[in-house]
């Protein structure tokens, strides 16, 4: 009797034990699928971060072009006022003399 | 004696099914550990892609700011040349007048 | 003793549904997982899916929709839904205690035929 | 998805001989791989389960070894009645599991 009790406790543990293997399986399915997610998510992710520095790239070069056209407007701007009021003076100096003679 | 092989079967196999379930287990923690680590490095990376987006915008911004004053100070170049052209003009005809009185 | 048996397996047109039941004697369903795998004539076994003591159905990628894994009472049955010519194959259920064990017992398998 | 490449397709030897099977997983499957024998017009019979283990009633000439994505079965001092094709069964999880295209063995 004693022998079959203990091969009932022995099969009741063994059974436990299987559901418990199902578990752990299913939990394992479920993880390794949470992760294949994750891992495409993250790769998909280094492409978005990838494109968006070649972009952040390429505005920054773009923004420095821009910045140094800028530039050169400017110092032509001042150029060209320069001899705007250059001429201004010549023309206002020849009124004068022409006046004055 | 068939009762015991039986028992003797049974253990070995619940041996082995603990067994069994050491080794779930620990793939489970090790894909866990993985998950963890693809989560951790994607919910990264989204930060990076917000981070890149915000200055991306920035320099979009910027860009579209640094054209908008590269279109005015191209219109006060051709303004200021029109007007140096004006003067020159006026000067030259003025200069004639002068010589032919 | 343990066993499994097929049975369900016929000639059937395309498109019509047909049941397959694997029937066990000696063995503890809600402890055991049942796994159904399939052979076209002179090709090699294919995986199709199996249903955990639980209850719970898994399928390969490729069998999702078209076959249906349910466990009605001490039977577990392959429901094959709109089968077409490519189906024609002895199928099989088999009994496993999970992944570390193998499918260590399996039923003699019954052939299905689709033609039209 | 988990593919199984089972090489060779066929194989031949004396009795006696040893034969030599590998079954490569895409991706690592840890040790649960098994091995199964088919002779015509019968079921497949299990030979090892948990990559290495022989199961109950197999002979010891048959022997598996390997882990992750490499495995292999060798048949030491082949017999007769080893005159069968053999398949290697992975499982990655409870979606990605396969058979691998199998082996015949002949006995010269």
């Known amino acids: 009797t004693a022998n079959s009790v203990a091969c009932r406790d022995g099969l009741r543990a063994q059974a436990e034990c299987r559901n418990t293997t199902h578990l752990l399986q299913r939990q394992l399915t479920r993880t390794q699928d949470s992760l294949l997610q994750a891992e495409t998510q993250a790769n998909s992710c280094n492409l978005t971060v990838v494109t968006l520095q070649e972009s952040l790239e390429k505005k920054v070069s773009q923004a420095l072009e821009q910045q140094a056209r800028i530039k050169e407007l400017e110092n032509e701007v001042t150029k060209l006022n320069q001899e705007l009021e250059n001429l201004r003076i010549q023309k206002e100096t020849s009124s004068t003399v022409q006046v004055n003679s | 004696t068939a009762n015991s092989v039986a028992c003797r079967d049974g253990l070995r196999a619940q041996a082995e099914c603990r067994n069994t379930t050491h080794l779930l287990q620990r793939q489970l923690t090790r894909t866990q550990d993985s998950l963890l680590q693809a989560e951790t490095q994607a919910n990264s990376c989204n930060l990076t892609v917000v981070t890149l987006q915000e200055s991306l915008e920035k320099k979009v911004s910027q860009a579209l700011e640094q054209q908008a004053r590269i279109k005015e100070l191209e219109n006060e170049v051709t303004k200021l040349n029109q007007e140096l052209e004006n003067l020159r003009i006026q000067k030259e005809t003025s200069s004639t007048v002068q010589v032919n009185s | 003793a343990q066993s499994l048996e097929e049975s369900g397996g016929r000639l059937v047109k395309p498109d019509e549904t047909l049941t397959l039941t694997c029937t066990v004697s000696?063995?503890?369903?809600?402890?055991?997982?049942i796994y159904w795998v399939r052979q076209a004539p002179g090709k090699g076994l294919e995986y199709i899916g199996f249903?955990?003591?639980?209850?719970d159905t898994y399928y390969a990628t490729w069998a999702k929709g078209r076959f249906t894994i349910s466990r009605p009472s001490t039977t577990v049955d392959l429901k094959i839904t709109s089968p077409t010519t490519g189906d024609t194959a002895t199928y099989f259920c088999?009994?496993?205690?999970?992944w570390g064990y193998g499918l260590d017992l399996w039923g003699p398998g019954t052939l299905v035929t689709i033609s039209s | 998805e988990l593919d199984l490449t089972q090489t060779p397709s066929s194989t031949s030897t004396a009795v006696g001989g040893t034969v030599t099977i590998n079954c490569q997983a895409s991706?690592?499957?840890?040790?649960?791989l098994s091995w199964y024998q088919q002779k015509p017009g019968q079921p497949p019979k299990l030979l090892i389960y948990?990559?290495?283990k022989l199961a109950s009633g197999v002979p010891s000439r048959f022997k598996g070894s390997g882990s992750g994505t490499q495995f292999t079965l060798t048949i030491s001092g082949v017999q007769r009645e080893d005159v069968a094709t053999y398949y290697c069964?992975?499982?990655?999880?409870?979606?990605?599991?396969?058979f691998g295209g199998g082996t015949e063995v002949v006995v010269k």
């Open positions: 000696g063995i503890d369903l809600s402890s055991y997982m």
């Open positions: 991706q690592s499957i840890n040790v649960w």
């Open positions: 249903i955990y003591g639980s209850g």
């Open positions: 948990q990559a290495s």
């Open positions: 069964l992975g499982i990655y999880n409870d979606i990605d599991t396969a």
């Open positions: 088999a009994r496993s205690s999970g």
